[in-house]
Interface confidence: medium
C-alpha cells in the first residue's frame, strides 16, 4: 500500500531565530508540479495559499509554530514538520560563562552557564555554525550545559538565550559570544 502524498519541508531563511524588526522568509517545498500550497500559523486563523511567506520585519505576534501542506488534484499531502519561529531580542541578553574557564584541555570537562536577572525558566545554547541548539528542547529548563570529555569539535563560539515557558517563542537577545578554546589537540 502506498502512503498519502509525502509531506513537504518548511524552512525559515536565513534562520528560525529572528531578531525583532528583521526580515525572514518561510518557504514550503513540495515535489514539482504542486497545484496549491497552504502555509499557516498554528493556533491562529492566519494562513495563506502560497508556498512563500516573506516577513519584512519580525513582530512578537508572528512568533509561533508554522506548518504547511500542499494539494495535488483533490488530495492533500501530509503536513510538514512544525517550524518554530522565534522572535529574539524581546528581552535583555543573558550572560554566558564557562566553568572552570573558557580554555579547556582535550578530554577535560567544562560547563557553560547561562545567567539572567529575570525569572526565566528556559535556556537555549547555540554554537556558531550549528543550526540546532546544543541541547534538546526538553532539557532547556537547565541553565547549565555540561560538556563531558571535550574534543576539538567543541571549539568554537557559543551564545545563549533565555526565555519563559509561558511564552516559548519570545526570546531574549543573544548573550555576548563566548569563545571555547580546546588545548592539547
Amino acid at each position: 500500500q502506498s502512503g498519502p502524498l509525502p509531506k513537504p519541508s518548511l524552512q525559515a531563511l536565513p534562520s528560525s531565530l529572528v531578531p525583532l524588526e528583521k526580515p525572514v522568509t518561510l518557504r514550503c517545498q513540495g515535489p514539482p508540479g504542486v497545484d496549491l500550497y497552504r502555509l499557516e500559523k498554528l493556533s491562529s486563523s492566519r494562513y495563506q495559499d502560497q508556498a512563500v511567506l516573506f516577513i519584512p520585519a519580525m513582530k512578537r505576534s508572528l512568533a509561533g509554530r508554522y506548518r504547511c501542506s500542499y494539494q495535488n488534484g483533490s488530495l492533500w499531502s501530509l503536513p510538514s514538520d512544525q517550524l518554530e519561529l522565534v522572535a529574539t531580542g524581546v528581552f535583555a541578553k543573558p550572560s554566558l560563562s564557562a566553568q572552570p574557564g573558557p580554555a579547556v584541555s582535550s578530554g577535560g570537562d567544562v560547563t557553560l552557564q547561562c545567567q539572567t536577572r529575570y525569572g526565566f525558566d528556559q535556556f537555549a545554547l547555540y554554537k556558531e555554525g550549528d543550526p540546532a541548539p546544543y541541547k534538546n528542547p526538553e532539557r532547556w529548563y537547565r541553565a547549565s550545559f555540561p560538556i563531558i570529555t571535550v574534543t576539538a569539535a567543541h571549539s568554537g563560539t557559543y551564545r545563549c538565550y533565555s526565555f519563559s515557558s509561558r511564552d516559548p517563542y519570545l526570546w531574549s537577545a543573544p548573550s555576548d559570544p563566548l569563545e571555547l578554546v580546546v588545548t592539547g589537540t
Epitope: 502512503g3 498519502p4 509531506k7 499557516e40 498554528l42 493556533s43 486563523s45 494562513y47 501542506s69 492533500w76 501530509l78 503536513p79 514538520d81 512544525q82 540546532a132 534538546n136 528542547p137 526538553e138
Partner: antibody, heavy 114, light 106 residues
Framework: QVQLQESGPGLVAPSQSLSITCTVS????????VNWVRQPPSRGLEWLGM???????DYQSTLKSRLSISKDNSKSQVFLKMNSLTTDDTARYYC????????WGQGTSVTVSS | DIQMTQSPSSLSASVGGRVTITCKAS??????IAWYQHKPGKGPSLLIH???TLQPGVPSRFSGSGSGRDYSFSISNLQPEDIATYYC????????FGGGTKLEIK
C-alpha cells in the same frame, strides 16, 4: 515497506517505570516523527506524545511530568519511558508514524500489577 | 488542550446501509482531522486525513467532511468487514482522539 514493532516488559509493578522500544523499518527517523498511543482495557485510544524528526518532543499535558520519549536514529529505534506507574497505566501501547499516524505497530500489552 | 467529542458511542446498521459519525472539537481545528478504523488485535488503520482525503487503498464508500469545529465521517454501502471501532483524531494542536464509535451490523 513501512513497519513498526513495539517491544515491552509485559508486566510492571506499581510505582516502577515502564520502558518500551519501537523499532521501525522502511523510513528514516531523521525525517519522520513517531507517536506513542495507548488503549486501556475496554477504553478508547489515548495519545501520549511524539518525537519529531529533529528530536524535539511533544507530550500530552496530563502525562508530561512522568513521560519521556527519545530515539536512536542509527538503530531506527524510538523509546518510551513512563515513571511512577499505577494500575491505570495498564494498556496496550502502540507506536505510529508521524502525523497523522499513517502506519502503526501491532502494539504491546502492559499490565501494571503487584 | 483540544477536546474531541465523538458521537454516537455505538451504532448498529444493516449491510448495504449508511452510517454517519460526528466529532466536535472544542476549538477550530482548521480541517486537521483524521479518521481511523480499529479492529481487535490490530493496530488502527488510517482511513482519511485532512478532513476528506482518502488514504490510498481505502474504498470510496468511506468519506469525510466538515470545517471549523464540526466534522463528520460516513460509510455508505455498509459491508460485514466494516465491523470495528472508529475514532476521530485532531492534529491541529498536539493530538487528541475522540472517544470512539463501535459499529455493529444488524
Amino acid at each position: 515497506q513501512v513497519q513498526l514493532q513495539e517491544s515491552g516488559p509485559g508486566l510492571v509493578a506499581p510505582s516502577q517505570s515502564l520502558s518500551i522500544t519501537c523499532t521501525v523499518s522502511g523510513f528514516s527517523l531523521t525525517y519522520y516523527g513517531v507517536n506513542w498511543v495507548r488503549q486501556p482495557p475496554s477504553r478508547g485510544l489515548e495519545w501520549l506524545g511524539m518525537i519529531w524528526g529533529d528530536g524535539s518532543t511533544d507530550y500530552q499535558s496530563t502525562l508530561k511530568s512522568r513521560l519521556s520519549i527519545s530515539k536512536d536514529n542509527s538503530k531506527s529505534q524510538v523509546f518510551l519511558k513512563m515513571n511512577s506507574l499505577t494500575t491505570d497505566d495498564t494498556a496496550r501501547y502502540y507506536c505510529a508514524r508521524d502525523l497523522p499516524m499513517d502506519y502503526w505497530g501491532q502494539g504491546t500489552s502492559v499490565t501494571v500489577s503487584s | 488542550d483540544i477536546q474531541m467529542t465523538q458521537s454516537p458511542s455505538s451504532l448498529s446498521a444493516s449491510v448495504g446501509g449508511r452510517v454517519t459519525i460526528t466529532c466536535k472539537a472544542s476549538q477550530d481545528i482548521n480541517k486537521y482531522i483524521a479518521w481511523y478504523q480499529h479492529k481487535p488485535g490490530k493496530g488502527p488503520s488510517l482511513l482519511i486525513h485532512y478532513t476528506s482525503t482518502l488514504q490510498p487503498g481505502v474504498p470510496s464508500r468511506f468519506s469525510g467532511s466538515g470545517s471549523g469545529r464540526d466534522y463528520s465521517f460516513s460509510i455508505s454501502n455498509l459491508q460485514p468487514e466494516d465491523i470495528a471501532t472508529y475514532y476521530c483524531l485532531q492534529y491541529a494542536l498536539l493530538l487528541t482522539f475522540g472517544g470512539g464509535t463501535k459499529l455493529e451490523i444488524k
